[in-house]
Interface confidence: low
């Protein structure tokens, strides 16, 4: 009675079970009755992830220099590889097919998380008592100058994009 | 001033070998992908093959592919061009050229190319 | 594989005149980073090619104004303003938006 169903880790053809290639591994030939399933090693900069009956290697991912990849982690025969961002852009997407610059935090806006290869930067607005006078993709809120603790006193106020102007305090005869 | 200066090319008979190497200079060679690009006498031009800076990456034309094999030797400074089971359809002047990058994709500086005959 | 055509093959102008080769391609250069992958290339007579328009319209370092590229997709346009016979030679076009880049079959410029 030819099977239904196979084991773990093989495959139903004509009428009979083959065992599956291993990862790092693509098909050559169907098992026969006589002979067993037909496998060949992926070539360098191909791969197969699974258990599998492919007849063709997966093509590693190019991280292209052209759109701002680099390598973050090289494939090998069972594992693509992982594309990264260069220094100062980030990713457009989870599967980070390109990359952008990372985004500045315009005056009036401070950095609440610096960007990495895989996320932009985190702007906040600068809270009353702060400031950022800079287009930064670094640079946080910077608190106003106080002006008591020079002896002086405020002549401008502060805004989220200006620091407080102290000057003298004005002396009564 | 970036300068690349191809060496290797000569006459050859069908189905023999030839290697093709790129001095480069003037940059940092490590940094950039290279590419070779051939043009057959009085033709245009095709792409061959390129290499990504590392050299984990390396795609070549189907016209070449599973004859031809580029590789780098970043220590050497030198990028190669290994041909094997030459073909008269391969006679041309081989250029090997460096990868712009992110802002000029594609070939941007050249060699003054190699030329390679390949006949009986 | 992307297949780049070229019009006209070949083009005769005068000194100080105007001249515009078309180039397409058979599937967009346009990448999802807003940018044409396109490249465009003048050879000289007896010399190594020489890149003049990167992404479809960035002047390459040390090449005259008098050069232009536009275009989005897969139709582009190499322009010189006012030809100097300098410029002869052969123009290609060539796609670096995926392996195997491919160029055009060129366009041959000519002073009248």
């Known amino acids: 009675e030819p099977p239904t169903a196979c084991r773990e880790k093989q495959y139903l053809i004509n009428s009979q079970c083959c065992s599956l290639c291993q990862p790092g591994q693509k098909l050559v030939s169907d098992c026969t009755e006589f002979t067993e399933t037909e496998c060949l090693p992926c070539s360098e900069s191909e791969f197969l992830d699974t258990w599998n009956r492919e007849t063709r290697c997966h093509q590693h991912k190019y991280c292209d220099p052209n759109l701002g990849l680099q390598v973050q982690q090289k494939g090998t025969s069972e594992t693509d590889t992982i594309c990264t961002c260069e220094e100062g852009l980030h990713c457009t997407s989870e599967s980070c097919e390109s990359c952008v610059p990372h985004r500045s935090c315009l005056p009036g806006f401070g950095v609440k998380q610096i960007a990495t290869g895989v996320s932009d930067t985190i702007c906040e607005p600068c809270p009353v008592g702060f400031f950022s006078n800079v287009s930064s993709a670094f640079e946080k809120c910077r608190p106003w100058t106080s002006c008591e603790t020079k002896d002086l006193v405020v002549q401008q106020a502060g805004t989220n994009k200006t620091d407080v102007v102290c000057g003298p305090q004005d002396r009564q005869r | 001033q970036v300068q690349l200066v191809e060496s290797g090319g000569g006459v050859v008979q069908p189905g023999r070998s030839l290697r093709l190497s790129c001095a480069a200079s003037?940059?940092?060679?490590?940094?950039?992908?290279m590419h070779w690009v051939r043009q057959a006498p009085g033709k245009g031009l095709e792409w061959v093959a390129v290499i990504s800076y590392e050299e984990s990456n390396r795609y070549h034309a189907d016209s070449v592919k599973g004859r031809f094999t580029i590789s780098r030797d970043n220590s050497k400074i030198t990028l190669y061009l290994q041909m094997n089971s030459l073909r008269t359809e391969d006679t041309a002047v081989y250029y090997c050229a460096r990868d712009g990058g992110i802002a000029a994709p594609g070939p941007d500086y050249w060699g003054q190319g190699t030329l390679v005959t390949v006949s009986s | 594989d992307i297949v780049m055509t070229q019009s006209p093959l070949s083009l005769t102008v005068t000194p100080g005149e105007p001249a515009s080769i078309s180039c397409r391609s058979s599937?967009?250069?346009?990448?999802?980073?807003?940018?044409?992958?396109l490249d465009w290339y003048l050879q000289k007579p007896g010399q190594s090619p020489q890149v003049l328009i990167s992404?479809?319209?960035n002047r390459a370092s040390g090449v005259p104004d008098r050069f232009s590229g536009s275009g989005s997709g897969t139709d582009f346009t190499l322009k010189i303003s006012r030809v100097e016979a300098e410029d002869v030679g052969v123009y290609y076009c060539?796609?670096?938006?995926?392996?195997?880049?491919?160029f055009g079959p060129g366009t041959k410029v000519d002073i009248r």
């Open positions: 992404l479809g319209s």
């Open positions: 003037g940059f940092t060679f490590s940094s950039y992908g």
């Open positions: 060539m796609q670096a938006r995926q392996t195997p880049f491919t």
């Open positions: 599937q967009s250069l346009l990448y999802s980073n807003g940018y044409n992958y």
